[in-house]
């Protein structure tokens, strides 16, 4: 039985050019986290993050993505295309997978203001 | 260059534990993942697991219970032991590693692999 | 588990002409897909990784594509030397499975 819940930032805004982190916490459940991929709106890999064995930043991604803080990932030199969902995909053994879902509007910068909790100056 | 050579006893009894080492050369196995890989006759290629160059190991779940990876840092090798072995682990075992950083899950060396068969 | 089913089991091809191997999952993994070459006699090479990114080394009459569920290892033009054992494996999720590979002879 699957009993933990995914946390996640939720719907945030950053400055095109600027950066931004993502973050998913998984919590009420004692099962072994695995793995954790980060997908596009696309449903394209970003990253993955093994438990073992570390970060894997996608080939495509190299130089717009770092990986961290945590398990969480940082998008840099954002574009208005990187507006959209982002998924946190927590493969755990034994419940299975657990999904977060982040929603990111990058927003010209003449807009300004943007959400600061998860922004990197 | 990367170089990986299995070794150990090609003929295992039934109940008996197998175990397996990879001589690595040309590359320290505290850097990267170093995996056990498998292929009975006939069958897929199965993932049975893996130690990172931490220490730290996983193991598929289906083969969890009998698996134990480990690893020598001052002889550069690690092993396999697989307990209460069946006709059913008869298989090629390959040693290989695994650079996640730039690959992913993506095996870029193996082994030549060495033949294993459980037999009384 | 995810499970990576091959098509076709095997394939006959004249030198010069192209070759296509599929690879289907059972679930979405995204692009978290390697292609190997086994050689008669040896151990399985790299050739793609992500999907299609060529691992160093290998001639570019290799390539990959596809995401989800759906790949596909194309040889633009077959040479002798291409025989052999072609296995898809997924990376998505652990534990990390293989399709039950792909046998390229030459005509």
């Known amino acids: 039985m699957m009993t933990g819940t995914i946390e996640t930032t939720g719907n945030i805004s950053a400055k095109k050019g600027g950066s931004v982190i993502l973050q998913c916490h998984l919590s009420s459940t004692m099962a072994q986290v695995t793995q954790v991929n980060w997908e596009q709106h696309d449903h394209s890999l970003l990253a993955i993050r093994n438990a073992e064995l570390g970060w894997h930043i996608y080939p495509a991604f190299k130089d717009r993505v770092a990986p961290g803080p945590g398990l969480g990932l940082t998008l840099q030199s954002l574009t208005m295309n990187d507006t959209g969902e982002y998924f946190c995909t927590y493969h755990t053994y034994p419940d299975g997978t657990y999904r977060g879902r982040i929603f990111l509007e990058v927003l010209e910068s003449s807009v300004a203001e943007h959400s600061a909790r998860f922004q990197i100056p | 260059e990367v170089q990986l050579q299995e070794s150990g006893p090609g003929l295992v009894k039934p109940s008996e534990t197998l175990s397996l080492t990879c001589a690595v050369s040309?590359?320290?196995?505290?850097?990267?993942?170093w995996n056990w890989i498998r292929q009975p006759p006939g069958k897929k290629l199965e993932w049975i697991g893996y130690?990172?160059?931490?220490?730290?190991?996983y193991y598929n779940p289906s083969l969890k219970s009998r698996v134990t990876i480990s690893r020598d840092t001052s002889k550069n090798q690690f092993s396999l032991k697989l307990s209460s072995v069946t006709a059913a682990d008869t298989a090629v075992y390959y040693c290989a590693r695994l650079d996640f950083s730039n690959y992913g899950g993506a095996v870029d060396y193996w082994g030549q692999g060495t033949t294993v068969t459980v037999s009384s | 588990d995810i499970v990576m089913t091959q098509t076709p089991l095997s394939l006959s091809v004249t030198p010069g002409q192209p070759a296509s191997i599929s690879c289907k999952a059972s679930?979405?993994?995204?692009?978290?897909v390697a292609w190997y070459q086994q050689k008669p006699g040896q151990s399985p090479q790299l050739m793609i990784y992500?999907?299609?990114y060529r691992y160093t080394g290998v001639p570019d009459r290799f390539s990959g594509s596809g995401s989800g569920t759906d790949f596909t290892l194309k040889i633009s033009r077959v040479e002798a030397e291409d025989v052999g054992v072609y296995y898809c494996q997924q990376y998505y999720t652990t534990p990390w499975t293989f399709g039950g590979g792909t046998k390229v002879e030459i005509k």
């Open positions: 679930q979405n993994v995204r692009t978290a």
């Open positions: 130690i990172s160059y931490s220490g730290n190991t």
């Open positions: 992500s999907a299609s």
């Open positions: 040309g590359y320290s196995i505290t850097s990267d993942s």
